[in-house]
């Protein structure tokens, strides 16, 4: 595991900075992927992980940034514009939309932090919100009032 | 506002510990809630947020722990055992299951950290994985081989 240097603030340092010495491993989604005969196809499998059995199936796309914590994030990408029929598992049903569920996740970006006299004092972590897509969900289309 | 003290390790300290001085705010999911006439009922709305328009609708339950970071997490709770019909939005279709999508989220627990001679040196953050349910997904039931 690689470590980011720890950073301890001198008294005058901005208290909004988040400071961390870090040892991290990527945390992929919980359920391990199983082989999927048509990994990118718009169909709902009868076995395999949840994202391939869903009638709004999706794949995960890795987003890696070594200056961000967590370094590895996964974005869901819908494989169908509409939901797949529960009956056949392959034909699309235009009465349902496959929509991404988003979440604003807290992440940290490392940047140099400086001591009292402007000297480089390791790295500090800057807190940001980062938009990730968690899954695809089969929804009824909005009816505008 | 007061802050947890930062904690910098002495040389011999275990490098698997994550150490942080932190200022955070709860980060709720992205889409604001809209009114839902039957907030706890098993139906798919034609308006409102994604979790109420889904044919596997869910609600969010707050999980707050003041010694954890983030302090506020939200767990999805499915409102139906099966998926709701796309046609009616209310009748359940036994051909589809409403299943929770889980994720192992990185969280931090605070605990006292100690200096070289066992003296109390503020708080350290211990990294853990914490299982959260993100959403409910309409899936085809597994066919056992």
């Amino acid at each position: 595991y690689s470590h980011w240097p720890s950073c301890c603030p001198s008294k005058g340092q901005d208290t909004s900075e988040e400071l961390l010495r870090w040892s991290t491993v990527p945390v992929p989604p919980l359920e391990p992927a199983r082989p999927n005969r048509h990994p990118e196809s718009c169909r709902a499998s009868e076995d395999g992980p949840l994202n391939s059995r869903a009638i709004s199936p999706w794949r995960y796309e890795l987003d890696r940034d070594l200056n961000r914590l967590p370094q590895d994030l996964y974005h869901a990408r819908c494989l169908c514009p509409h939901c797949v029929s529960l009956q056949t598992g392959s034909h699309m049903d235009p009465r349902g939309n496959s929509e991404l569920l988003y979440h604003n996740q807290t992440v940290f970006y490392r940047r140099p932090c400086h001591g009292e006299k402007g000297t480089h004092k390791g790295y500090c972590l800057e807190r940001r919100l980062y938009r990730v897509s968690l899954a695809c969900v089969c929804v009824r289309p909005r009816v505008m009032g | 506002y007061s802050h947890w003290p930062s904690c910098c390790p002495s040389k011999g300290q275990d490098t698997s510990e994550e150490l942080l001085r932190w200022s955070t705010v709860p980060v709720p999911p992205l889409e604001p809630a809209r009114p839902n006439r039957h907030p706890e009922s098993c139906r798919a709305s034609e308006d409102g947020p994604l979790n109420s328009r889904a044919i596997s609708p869910w609600r969010y339950e707050l999980d707050r722990d003041l010694n954890r970071l983030p302090q506020d997490l939200y767990h999805a709770r499915c409102l139906c055992p099966h998926c709701v019909s796309l046609q009616t939005g209310s009748h359940m279709d036994p051909r589809g299951n409403s299943e929770l999508l889980y994720h192992n989220q990185t969280v931090f627990y605070r605990r006292p950290c100690h200096g070289e001679k066992g003296t109390h040196k503020g708080y350290c953050l211990e990294r853990r994985l914490y299982r959260v349910s993100l959403a409910c997904v309409c899936v085809r039931p597994r066919v056992m081989g």
Epitope: - | Y1, S2, H3, W4, W22, S23, T24, V25, P26, P28, P29, E31, P32, A33, N36, P39, P49, N51, S52, R59, Y60, E61, L62, R64, L66, L69, Q71, D72, Y74, R110
Partner: antibody
Framework: EVQLVESGAEVKKPGASVKVSCKAS????????MNWVRQAPGQRLEWMGL????????SYNQNFKGRVTLTVDTSASTAYLELNSLRSEDTGVYYC???????????????WGQGTLVTVS | DIQMTQSPSSLSASVGDRVTITCSAS??????LNWYQQKPGKVPKLLIY???SLHSGVPSRFSGSGSGTDFTLTISSLQPEDVATYYC?????????FGQGTKLEIK
């Protein structure tokens, strides 16, 4: 100026339901959780639950045995408390209260509605 | 649930007196304690948060202290407008719980 304005007094029969509203103004409604607190005559304050308007996320006091439902209408900046299967001991003043917070240290009810008197008899 | 117990339940003091109200938690709550003031016929108001931090607009004669299970609200010099019932509240765990209140009157 932050304001929480609750609906008017209600008189209900035992077994009925009541729905109290709380209209917020003067701040970003979705940015703060809303608590509901009850005060029966001569009794201590009793926390009923809270709701995050951003996602409808809730936490309830289990002592109310599932009789409480909290909802919001973000477009109207309004929170709702519904209490069903009313009994005489539910008589009291019901308050909504905005919850402020700071990193790690506090969650506190900094603004309160004027209260809604619910009488069950 | 965490039980919060205040003492005394009521007290009478003179203007200018130093007044102390205590609050005891049935288990340790670190410093996760708030104090509220409710004047007769009025809505509760936040007085002190996180054991000792004064809410904005609250006079400096009010102070709070404590940690773990035992907490204190102190009014250094009682004023006539301080007539009220005072409640402590823990927020380390759901459900939030309040003390039974301390009714403060002027002699």
């Amino acid at each position: 100026e932050v304001q929480l304005v609750e609906s008017g007094a209600e008189v209900k029969k035992p077994g009925a339901s009541v729905k109290v509203s709380c209209k917020a103004s003067g701040y970003s409604f979705s940015g703060y959780t809303m608590n509901w607190v009850r005060q029966a005559p001569g009794q201590r304050l009793e926390w009923m639950g809270l709701i995050n308007p951003y996602n409808g996320g809730t936490s309830y006091n289990q002592n109310f045995k599932g009789r409480v439902t909290l909802t919001v209408d973000t477009s109207a900046s309004t929170a709702y408390l519904e209490l069903n299967s009313l009994r005489s001991e539910d008589t009291g003043v019901y308050y909504c209260a905005r919850e402020d917070y700071d990193s790690w240290t506090f969650f506190a009810m900094d603004y309160w509605g004027q209260g809604t008197l619910v009488t069950v008899s | 649930d965490i039980q919060m117990t205040q003492s005394p339940s009521s007290l009478s003091a003179s203007v200018g007196d130093r007044v102390t109200i205590t609050c005891s938690a049935s288990q340790g709550i670190n410093e996760y304690l708030n104090w509220y003031q409710q004047k007769p016929g009025k809505v509760p108001k936040l007085l002190i948060y996180y054991t000792s931090s004064l809410h904005s607009g609250v006079p400096s004669r009010f102070s709070g202290s404590g940690s773990g299970t035992d907490f204190t609200l102190t009014i250094s010099s009682l004023q006539p407008e301080d007539v009220a019932t005072y409640y402590c509240q823990q927020y380390i765990n759901f459900p939030y719980t309040f003390g039974q209140g301390t009714k403060l009157e002027i002699k």
